[in-house]
């Protein structure tokens, strides 16, 4: 008999696990891209928006060649945990404008949580340490204004989009090295 219903499929092949993580990351990337576009349509953004509490982008074209699986997975998980916290904050603190995006933000949060669970599973299968974030988690303060929360939403979705984009590239490259 196979594993009990609902339990994760046990795989001895890390490449298959990585494939699964890549699929989830791609799916989340598509959702994020769509929601970011929706945000731009509904609440046009003038210029680039940044948020000090967001993680800095871990990967770039220059660093792709030197990537190691443990480092990538650990950093990706830490960064995505930060983005999850920011999405949760947006849903609660965003005001009426962002409440109109509530179904989509809720779905995005659920997908993000699912990807984090998959990464955690992958790390445990590869016997990698479940690293904690380098810095202590600082509570996210209230947006200064409604406009501030819209700017924050643009920054969060934009940053998540970039992070996921590099994550897909990095994971695919690492798969070839396994």
């Amino acid at each position: 008999p196979g594993p009990p219903a609902g339990s994760p499929r046990v795989s001895s092949d890390p490449r298959a696990d990585l494939d699964s993580a890549v699929l989830l990351t791609r799916s989340l990337l598509a959702d994020t891209r769509q929601l970011a576009a929706q945000m731009r349509d509904k609440f046009p953004a003038d210029g680039d928006h940044s948020l000090d509490s967001l993680p800095t982008l871990a990967m770039s074209a220059g660093t792709l060649g030197s990537l190691q699986l443990p480092g990538v997975l650990t950093r990706l998980r830490v960064d995505l945990m930060s983005y999850l916290r920011h999405v949760q904050w947006l849903r609660r603190a965003g005001g009426p404008s962002l409440k109109t995006l509530e179904p989509e933000l809720g779905a995005l949060q659920a997908r993000l949580e699912r990807l984090l669970r998959r990464l955690q599973l992958l790390m445990s299968r590869l016997a990698l340490p479940q690293a904690a974030p380098d810095q202590p988690v600082i509570p996210l303060g209230p947006p200064a204004s409604a406009w501030g929360s819209i700017r924050a939403a643009h920054a969060i979705l934009g940053g998540l989009h970039l992070t996921l984009d590099w994550a897909v590239r990095g994971l695919l490259l690492l798969k070839t090295r396994l």
Epitope: S97, K99, P143, S145, W147, S149
Partner: antibody
């Protein structure tokens, strides 16, 4: 300093209309969502409506839906509440309130609306 | 009837600690921030606690907020006569797409 001043209240007969205004000063009005909250004599607070910073998003309490309209003029730093088909149960002090997100950080002093024949 | 449930009254003597509860559901308190307002007789409400447990500048640290699941509470320690007022809890409600308030709690400072 932040100031919100409501006006336009008064005595009105059932079925008639009234328009309330809320003049805002001391902050960048166009960056904030704005709400109307009311309080019937001797009763608790009741939320009425909200309008987003740009005016594109509006939500209403079920008790006023279809009768009241919230609007704003960012060039005049003014919030409005158009109240039609007024009923006796709409009698209350109406407050405008500013919100940076999920809470009302500043309130006006209120304007009394009395619906009576 | 209010969506959020508060006790209609509470009382205490000067120096005492008083707690006011606010009960809601998963669509309001359970998934959104809780705020508390103080309304002194004949005046407009004033923000007391926001984001579940934060105090605006100028609000004494005798006032504190907390939240667990679908309930929240406001605690006032070192009760003073000037704390006699009506207290309201509030939160956004995702099902109603609007703000909901508790019915209010009238706090009386005895003696």
């Amino acid at each position: 300093q932040v100031q919100l001043v409501e006006s336009g209240g008064g005595v009105v007969q059932p079925g008639r209309s009234l328009r309330l205004s809320c003049a805002a000063s001391g902050f960048t009005f166009s960056h904030y969502d704005m709400h109307w909250v009311r309080q019937a004599p001797g009763k608790g607070l009741e939320w009425v409506a909200v309008i987003s910073y740009s005016g594109s998003v509006k939500f209403y309490a079920d008790s006023v839906k279809g009768r009241f309209t919230i609007s704003r003029d960012n060039s005049k730093n003014t919030l409005y509440l158009q109240m039609n088909s007024l009923r006796a149960e709409d009698t209350a002090v109406y407050y405008c309130a500013r919100t940076p997100g999920s809470h009302f950080d500043y309130w006006g002093q209120g304007t009394l609306v009395t619906v009576s024949s | 009837q209010s969506v959020l449930t508060q006790p209609p009254s509470a009382s205490g003597t000067p120096g005492q600690r008083v707690t006011i509860s606010c009960s809601g559901s998963s669509s309001n308190i359970g998934s959104n921030y809780v705020n508390w307002y103080q309304q002194l007789p004949g005046t407009a409400p004033k923000l007391l606690i926001y984001y579940d447990d934060l105090r605006p500048s100028g609000v004494p640290d005798r006032f504190s907020g907390s939240k667990s699941g679908t309930s929240a509470s406001l605690a006032i320690s070192g009760l003073r006569s000037e704390d006699e007022a009506d207290y309201y809890c509030s939160a956004w409600d995702d099902s109603l797409s609007g703000v909901v308030f508790g019915g209010g709690t009238k706090l009386t400072v005895l003696g």
